[in-house]
Interface confidence: medium
């Protein structure tokens, strides 16, 4: 099965890297520093 991060979820993560967790069939984001949220779209104002 192809990695959805390279297809339909290619632009899913705004400030982070798309990760596909194969054993859960789940697309998630690993955020850049200072960013958080499902798509790494929220900025941590305390950082």
């Amino acid at each position: 099965k192809k990695n959805p991060c390279n297809a339909e979820f290619q632009n899913f993560c705004i400030h982070g890297e798309c990760k596909y967790i194969e054993h859960l069939e789940a697309v998630t984001c690993k955020c850049q520093q200072e960013y958080f949220g499902e798509r790494c779209g929220e900025k941590d104002l305390l950082a």
């Epitope: 099965k1 990760k19 967790i21 054993h23 859960l24 069939e25 789940a26 998630t28 984001c29 690993k30 955020c31 520093q33 960013y35 958080f36 949220g37 499902e38 790494c40 941590d44």
Partner: antibody, heavy 124, light 112 residues
Framework: EVQLVESGGGLVKPGGSLRLSCAAS????????MSWVRQAPEKGLEWVST????????YYPDSVKGRFTISRDNAKNSLYLQMNSLRAEDTAVYYC?????????????????WGQGTTVTVSS | DIVMTQSPLSLPVTLGDPASISCRSS???????????LNWFQQRPGQSPKLLIY???ERFDGVPDRFSGSGSGTDFTLKISRVEAEDVGVYYC?????????FGGGTKVEIK
């Protein structure tokens, strides 16, 4: 609001079968792995099964492997647990639980929301 | 399978006093870059379990800051800085680093 409502529990004889259901609402069901956890009377929690978002991968402890089958219908926002060859030791409250993810700058999967449970009694 | 051992089994506390629960795993729960999959759940009498702490020390949504988690590797602790009446119940640690996922036996917090 995340809601998980289990049903299908009841009294069954040893060797019998039962199918539990969990109706999910308040979130995009198809995006979340799901689990079943049980609690025997006056005992602790025991993980029973987990299923991936699309249902391709399923996981069980040895205590139920080969007897229980987890499945899901994403179109119906529903999770199921088919229980066969039931034993007295399967008597428990069965909880349906959502598997994260919780985002804190990186994904992390945990059983973040649980249903109220449905009671299964295996007795002759 | 990873065995999760909690202590004490029962914890009688005075309202307003601190409380501490220990959880030890039979092997390390560190999972590479993904962190440590150690969680704490609270089960109040007659209710279903609720997620309290995830990833060792992160409080879940709506959890009061009197609850804190700490630890690493195989040794973990849940602390309640000042116990309130609503904190009565059973607390479970749980690991989801390795299948099968396993829970500790539980610690019953009650008011003296």
């Amino acid at each position: 609001e995340v809601q998980l409502v289990e049903s299908g529990g009841g009294l069954v004889k040893p060797g019998g079968s039962l199918r539990l259901s969990c109706a999910a609402s308040g979130f995009t069901f198809s995006s979340y792995p799901m689990s079943w956890v049980r609690q025997a009377p006056e005992k602790g929690l025991e993980w029973v099964s987990t299923i991936s978002t699309g249902g391709r991968y399923t996981y069980y402890p040895d205590s139920v492997k080969g007897r229980f089958t987890i499945s899901r219908d994403n179109a119906k926002n529903s999770l199921y647990l088919q229980m066969n060859s039931l034993r007295a030791e399967d008597t428990a409250v069965y909880y349906c639980a959502r598997q994260g993810p919780i985002y804190y700058g990186n994904y992390y999967y945990a059983m973040d929301y649980w249903g109220q449970g449905t009671t299964v009694t295996v007795s002759s | 399978d990873i065995v999760m051992t909690q202590s004490p089994l029962s914890l009688p506390v005075t309202l307003g006093d601190p409380a501490s629960i220990s959880c030890r795993s039979s092997q390390s729960l560190v999972d590479g870059e993904d962190g440590t999959y150690l969680n704490w759940f609270q089960q109040r009498p007659g209710q279903s379990p609720k997620l309290l702490i995830y990833k060792v020390s992160e409080r879940f949504d709506g959890v009061p800051d009197r609850f804190s988690g700490s630890g690493s590797g195989t040794d973990f602790t849940l602390k309640i800085s000042r116990v309130e009446a609503e904190d009565v119940g059973v607390y479970y640690c749980s690991q989801s680093t390795h299948v099968p996922y396993t829970f500790g036996g539980g610690t019953k917090v009650e008011i003296k």
